[in-house]
């Protein structure tokens, strides 16, 4: 028969022969022959391969370096890489999460729209009219101005995006 020029799924072509790929979690030791199946070996401790493959070496699991603020979110297996995340108060600098930076704080006049996670930074938003933030914080949202009316008080000093209104007693001499 004519030697193949293409192979089925989960096979590869080597020297005019279709050989089975090694399953995830295993590496290639020896190509198949007409008489012998592809020889594969399981990846060692702290190694993985996550696809059907013909790799002769497994990949090393990612190391979550605590010196870079990293910790293990999900331990790797022979078929999956380790997933790192950042320590509390820090987030990844990239999708690959190779290092961490401190969550940013929202300055006075800005509130937290979305609290940071291990993989995303704090999202701040300017405090709209009627709201304020007078602190630098990674958690505080913009607070609404105090409603003087509900306390039977009047506004003595208008609020800003950084300060609350100041309420005071009503002028009793007023008709």
């Amino acid at each position: 028969p004519e030697p193949p020029t293409a192979c089925r799924e989960k096979q590869y072509l080597i020297n005019s022969q279709c050989c089975s790929l090694c399953q995830p979690g295993q590496k290639l030791v020896s190509d198949c022959t007409e008489f012998t199946e592809t020889e594969c070996l399981p990846c060692g401790e702290s190694e993985f391969l996550d696809t059907w493959n013909r790799e002769t070496h497994c990949h090393q699991h990612k190391y979550c370096d605590p010196n870079l603020g990293l910790r293990v979110q999900q331990k790797g297996t022979s078929e999956t890489d380790t997933i790192c995340t950042c320590e509390e108060g820090w987030h990844c600098t990239s999708e690959a999460c190779e290092s961490c930076v401190l969550h940013r704080s929202c300055s006075p006049g800005f509130g937290v729209k979305q609290i940071a996670t291990g993989v995303s930074d704090t999202i701040c938003e300017p405090c709209p009219v009627g709201f304020f933030s007078n602190v630098s914080s990674a958690f505080e949202k913009c607070h609404p101005w105090t409603s003087c009316e509900t306390k039977d008080l009047v506004v003595q000093q208008a609020g800003t995006n950084k300060t609350d209104v100041v309420c005071g007693p009503q002028d009793r001499l007023r008709a």
Partner: antibody, heavy 117, light 109 residues
Amino acid sequence: QVQLVESGGGVVQPGRSLRLSCAASGFTFGSYGMHWVRQAPGKGLEWVAVISYEGVKKYYADSVKGRFTISRDNSKNTLYLQMNSLRAEDTAVYYCARDTSRGHDIWGQGTMVTVSS
Amino acid sequence: EIVLTQSPGTLSLSPGERATLSCRASQSVSYDYLAWYQQKPGQAPRLLIYGASARANGIPDRFSGSGSGTDFTLTISRLEPEDFAVYYCQQYADYPPFTFGGGTKVEIK
């Protein structure tokens, strides 16, 4: 460890039969093709036969075709060579060897077959 | 059928010397599927080199294989006492039959 052990050799008269066995251990026997190779006294190596891992494909050297039959029992991790109509020129040490894309990587210690009247 | 011719038939050398063994094929060996084996008296052959130039597991680096097509060479850079043996080349690309060369005996001078 990975090992092949041949047995069944001996002295036999011309025209008679003999069955050689090769017991495998230390590896997944059912994933490998297997060969028989022989060596006449004081001579070089001569390939005899090969069988595929599942026993479907078999090839023979012209010198033994029609007289020798290679077979295997994967449940017993054993390879066989049935030798019929033996001749004086079949006298040799018979080795079994494992097939890989790297050549014959594991060999047994051999079993001696002497065909003599 | 691919015929393999090995030369010389016998090589007489002293320990520490370099040994160069030749294997010539009657036609090109596809994919360089050529192996070298070592055999000592009363023992089974042992795989040394496969794919013309790759060392098998546990084989010392003083053994090296080279060549392609029809001309192949096994070199032992510095002969050790345990290297005196018979060496066979074998092609496993074109079969049946899988063919062996006639062998080269490396003996102590």
